[in-house]
Interface confidence: medium
């Protein structure tokens, strides 16, 4: 049935899906706070621009009786049930914010006549790439993949003089939603990462991972995994590690590495951590104070989703254009808007661009130090520390093939 959009005559509504199954286990109250904070800012910005309009959010909750796993496993049906709820109420906003699970976003996109924009804090999987009316405000798997290929091929830096073409990927099935889809993308045989590598094997058992650390017959020195330092320690413990091993720990949504009092534990010395550059002042931003470091990014994405809508609404109203058109639905891409903690850039496909940071543990100071940064928007690496105090021989990253270390 045709659902009317509450999106005209000076009144603009945002439909926010509050799903029990979510990419991060964030209390819905915190997400509500994020949305309300965003609404205040949007209203102020519109008012200051001389646009006397009303902007509100409707929070759509699922009953939670059937879909109560809490993670993303039963999110497909929950998302569709919420859409049905909207349809039955004959009430849809100008924009849909949520869902965050890849399964539900993919299915909802497939099963609906999307004449309105969809903004997601999550939907990390490759199956949500290149969707015309979907905007993703947390780094999707495609961005990670492009960094890894770029870094593997790099061979002209003082600390990386070899191109790599091999890798192990550790994936045991207990990952968080973001990690699950990041590793899924690396595992997929048709993905860009797999296409560019000559050798890639997925390690699914703890023992497989542990054996590789000292296996003289290993096919690669490089192991990619996803999670925090504690996750690595549970797996690796204090086991001895061959000197040529490089572990790439993907931990994008964790800015604890940048806090002043953080010391890197000894088991992190063979590890390069890939994370996101913290916003200019994210660590002392008032909004993020009562959120954990990981969930900060999730709630922030909801807030930025509201600000993005406000940004587009302002442009269309100032140009005298209609909001309930395919043009509006397709406009949430290839732009930069003022986010809560600084400018936010979206690529041609509506996916957020960011600065990824590769950290190493300094053997001198036992602190995490920035080795290089990578701008996802231009697919370019920028070295930061030209003389890193690595654990690896000659302060250079080893070759990825055993027995051909730095010469």
């Amino acid at each position: 049935s045709q659902v009317s959009q509450n999106c005209h005559n000076g009144s603009y509504e945002i439909s926010v899906l509050m799903m029990g199954n979510s990419a991060f286990a964030e209390p819905l109250k915190n997400l509500e706070d994020a949305v309300n904070e965003g609404l205040e800012i949007v209203r102020g910005r519109l008012q200051n621009a001389g646009l006397n309009v009303t902007v509100n959010a409707t929070f759509m909750y699922s009953d939670g009786l059937i879909h109560n796993s809490g993670d993303c496993r039963s999110s497909t049906c929950e998302g569709l049930d919420l859409l049905r709820k909207i349809s039955n109420a004959q009430r849809m906003g100008c924009v849909l914010i949520g869902p965050s699970c890849t399964y539900s976003t993919f299915q909802m996109y497939l099963d609906t006549e999307l004449s309105y924009p969809m903004i997601s804090a999550g939907s990390f999987g490759l199956s949500c790439d290149y969707k015309e009316t979907l905007t993703r405000l947390m780094s999707p798997a495609r961005k990670l993949m492009y960094f890894l290929v770029n870094f593997w091929k790099t061979n002209d830096l003082p600390f990386k003089t070899y191109s790599w073409s091999t890798s192990y990927v550790y994936k045991n099935g207990t990952e968080t939603e973001d990690c699950f889809w990041y590793l899924n993308a690396l595992e997929a045989s048709v993905s860009y990462f797999s296409h560019e590598l000559g050798f890639k094997v997925v390690l699914r058992q703890d023992k497989e991972f542990q054996d590789i650390l000292m296996d003289h017959n290993r096919k690669s020195n490089v192991i990619i995994m996803c999670g925090g330092p504690e996750f690595l320690y549970k797996l690796k413990g204090d086991r001895a590690v061959a000197e040529d091993i490089v572990i790439i720990l993907v931990d994008l949504f964790n800015d604890q590495y940048f806090e002043d009092n953080v010391t890197a534990p000894d088991y992190m010395k063979n590890v390069l951590v890939l994370t996101l550059s913290p916003g200019n002042s994210l660590l002392n931003s008032s909004f993020s104070r009562n959120l954990s470091p990981t969930k900060r990014d999730f709630a922030l994405a909801y807030l930025n989703g509201i600000l993005l809508f406000g940004h587009m609404l302002k442009i269309f109203l100032e140009n005298g254009e209609n909001i309930t058109t395919p043009k509006f639905a397709h406009a949430f891409r290839n732009l930069t808007f003022e986010g809560y903690d600084g400018p936010v850039t979206l690529d041609d496909w509506g996916d957020v661009d960011s600065t990824m940071v590769l950290l190493y543990t300094s053997v001198d100071t036992k602190k995490y130090k920035v080795l290089l940064t990578y701008d996802t928007h231009v697919n370019k690496t920028y070295p930061v520390d030209m003389s890193p105090t690595f654990t690896w021989k000659n302060s250079k990253l080893p070759n990825d093939i055993t027995g051909r270390g730095p010469q």
Partner: nanobody
Amino acid sequence: EVQLVESGGGLVKPGGSLRLSCAASGRTSTIHRMGWFRQAPGKEREFVSSISRVSSTTYYADSVKGRFTISRDNAKNSLYLQMNSLRAEDTAVYYCAASEYEVSPGKSKYWGQGTMVTVSS
């Protein structure tokens, strides 16, 4: 342009109380969020508390939760920080800060000159 002027600092004994005020003037209609930061001698400036203009949503640093209360009076364009159960480690210069709708509220655009709070017996 917005100007911020703090007052109310001083010397107080541990366990005592103080109330800081911040008067805002200028283009105050553009202000979204106001807050307090502090800087102890030899340390970096740190977030203390903030409050939004419309809904008065508040945030506090863990170190002051339950002891400090932030409030604002929009009619008077003023911000307040009620500080109870003061400790020696609360000694610092306290700065009033404000950010506009047009800038990122995570970053404060306007700052006061600061008022000194000393907690000592």
